[in-house]
Interface confidence: medium
């Protein structure tokens, strides 16, 4: 597929390893890490990043690189969603976020591509051999899933790859194939980074970009796919899962869960903070599905205890068009 | 290549089941996308039917959903429509696609209900 | 209940500039479409989304003279230097919540 405009392809906004090597240096190492991040999952990327200002804080962050409508966006934990993870976050084009702790903010950072901060401390912090897992469903396409972790010895506000896939579902070009430059790279960043922590640690500054603004234009992902595809995912062992999240809160969720189709998400465990975030109208070229939506404006009923709706002041979001992602 | 061929028996009478399948080749139905069946009547008007994803769960066009269903065969690597209580609207020509935008479709076999 | 409309056939001469439209309803006008191309005895092949805000996307093999843009509800396919090869049948389509609708369809003749 092509764009109007083309962005980078491959490239995930706001490059992680900024202020902890200079801006020369740091071109070749995060060129490297997306290619590492992306290798073999080129429908999405997910990145992990360790905040510097809080040891215990994550930001996990990921993009559809797909063409076609983003039906809805599942964060989970732990594993992919319907295979032990358990959900953080679901971001919906048109009726809205929820989220469970510890997720602190989810947000739509562009048409394509999302962040969610999970809260640093209490029984249900994430530690750093955690494994994040993003789906994004396109009707009646596909739907893709890809995860990632972060490296349990990785320096905080350094973001790492995913871990390679064991268990990987696209149809997608160079799964199998990653080239040996593309290995020799991903080494060669290894190299670096270990090089780095070796160093006298610098002082981290925060990077440039606030994480409460849209990304600027060029370091939007290109998107492209509406077609429903599979997210292709990795899992990882993790220890860190917290025993207390599934039963945390009552079971159900608000009304508008019930409407969406099967394939759509698996329902969340309980509710919890709502949050209406439209999309940043100046994100990419990936249409948000119409099909799961809600009349523009619609607000989803108040069904459930700790269920706050936080009413969009920009008004009503722009409702886009669907194809399928499973 | 990824191709898609639909077959069928071409003619059924009214109040029957219509029943067609698609052959994949080339990528197997349980490895992702969303596996569709779409419809085209005489004025060429086109109607989504539904779809069966790669993990087997289903999607049904609303104003089809009490009489149609989409099952598959992985071993054989196809994917089948059923069509109950069938009457001379049903008459068209059926698609089967992976997904939509991406396709491929398939190039469609004709259907008439007839007595 | 969301509908697209499409005018049911256009004419062009060879090698002009043509513009198609597709209609949303008007409670659905920030919906972005897909349209489609079929050719005479073939099926539907994906041409391009149309986003609310006029940009657009093509699928792969689409010639460079095809392209989007959109107006409130209208969302608008247009080839340029069109070629006897684009007489078809151009439909709209726009999926919603779990279902999916095409337009009519506009039959495009190069003269």
């Known amino acids: 597929m092509r764009t109007e405009a083309q962005v980078p392809a491959l490239q995930p906004p706001e490059p992680g390893l900024e202020g902890a090597m200079g801006h020369r240096t740091l071109v070749l190492p995060w060129v490297l890490l997306t290619l590492c991040v992306t290798a073999g999952t080129p429908e999405v990327w997910v990145q992990v990043r360790m905040e510097a200002t809080e040891l215990s804080s994550f930001t996990i962050r990921c993009g559809f690189l797909g063409s076609g409508s983003i039906s809805l966006v599942t964060v989970s934990w732990g594993g992919p969603n319907g295979a032990g993870g358990t959900t953080l976050a679901v971001l919906h084009p048109e009726r809205g976020i929820r989220q469970w702790a510890p997720a602190r903010q989810a947000r739509w950072e562009t048409q394509s591509s999302i962040s969610l901060i999970l809260e640093g401390s209490g029984a249900s912090s994430p530690c750093a051999n955690t494994t994040f897992c993003c789906k994004f469903a396109s009707f009646p396409e596909g739907s893709w899933e890809a995860c990632g972790s972060l490296p349990p010895s990785s320096d905080p506000g350094l973001s790492a790859p995913p871990t390679p896939a064991p268990i990987l579902r696209a149809d997608l070009a160079g799964i199998l194939g990653v080239s040996g430059v593309l290995l020799f790279g991903c080494v060669y960043l290894l190299h670096l980074l270990r090089r780095h922590k070796h160093r006298p640690a610098p002082r981290l500054q925060p990077s440039r970009t606030s994480p409460q603004a849209p990304r600027a234009r060029a370091w939007a992902p290109s998107q492209a796919s509406q077609a429903a595809l599979h997210v292709p995912y990795a899992t990882i062992n993790t220890s860190c899962r917290p025993a207390t999240l599934d039963t945390a809160h009552p079971h159900g969720g608000p009304s508008w869960w019930a409407s969406l189709p099967t394939h759509a998400a698996h329902r969340p465990q309980g509710p919890a903070a709502w949050a209406s975030t439209p999309i940043p109208a100046r994100g990419s070229f990936v249409s948000v599905e119409n099909g799961l939506y809600a009349q523009a404006g619609e607000r989803p009923p108040h069904t459930g205890p700790g269920l706050t709706l936080f009413p969009d002041p920009r008004g009503p979001r722009a409702m886009e068009g669907p194809l399928g992602v499973r | 290549d990824v191709q898609l061929q639909e077959s069928g028996p071409g003619l059924v009478k009214p109040s029957q089941s219509l029943s067609l399948t698609c052959s994949v080749t080339?990528?197997?139905?349980?490895?992702?996308?969303?596996w569709n069946w779409i419809r085209q009547f005489p004025g060429n008007n086109l109607e989504w039917m539904g779809y069966i994803s790669s993990d087997g769960t289903n999607n049904y066009n609303p104003s089809l959903r009490n009489r149609i269903s989409i099952t598959r065969d992985t071993s054989k690597n196809q994917f089948f429509l059923k069509l109950n209580s069938v009457t001379t609207e049903d008459t068209a020509t059926y698609y089967c696609?992976?997904?939509?935008?991406?396709?491929?479709w398939g190039q469609g076999t004709t259907l008439t209900v007839s007595s | 209940q969301l509908i697209l409309t499409q005018s049911s056939s256009a004419s062009f001469s060879l090698g002009a500039s043509a513009k198609l439209t597709c209609t949303l309803s008007?409670?659905?006008?920030?919906?972005?479409i897909e349209w489609y191309q079929q050719q005479p005895l073939k099926a539907p092949k994906y041409v391009m989304e149309v986003k609310n805000d006029g940009s657009h996307r093509t699928g792969d093999g689409i010639p460079d003279r095809f392209s989007g843009s959109s107006s409130g509800a209208d969302r608008y396919l247009s080839i340029s230097n069109i070629q006897p090869e684009d007489e078809a049948i151009y439909i709209c389509?726009?999926?919603?919540?779990?279902?999916?609708?095409f337009g009519g369809g506009t039959k495009v003749t190069v003269l």
């Open positions: 008007s409670q659905h006008s920030t919906y972005t």
């Open positions: 696609a992976r997904g939509l935008r991406y396709g491929p």
């Open positions: 080339g990528y197997s139905i349980t490895s992702n996308y969303y």
């Open positions: 389509g726009v999926g919603d919540i779990n279902n999916y609708i």
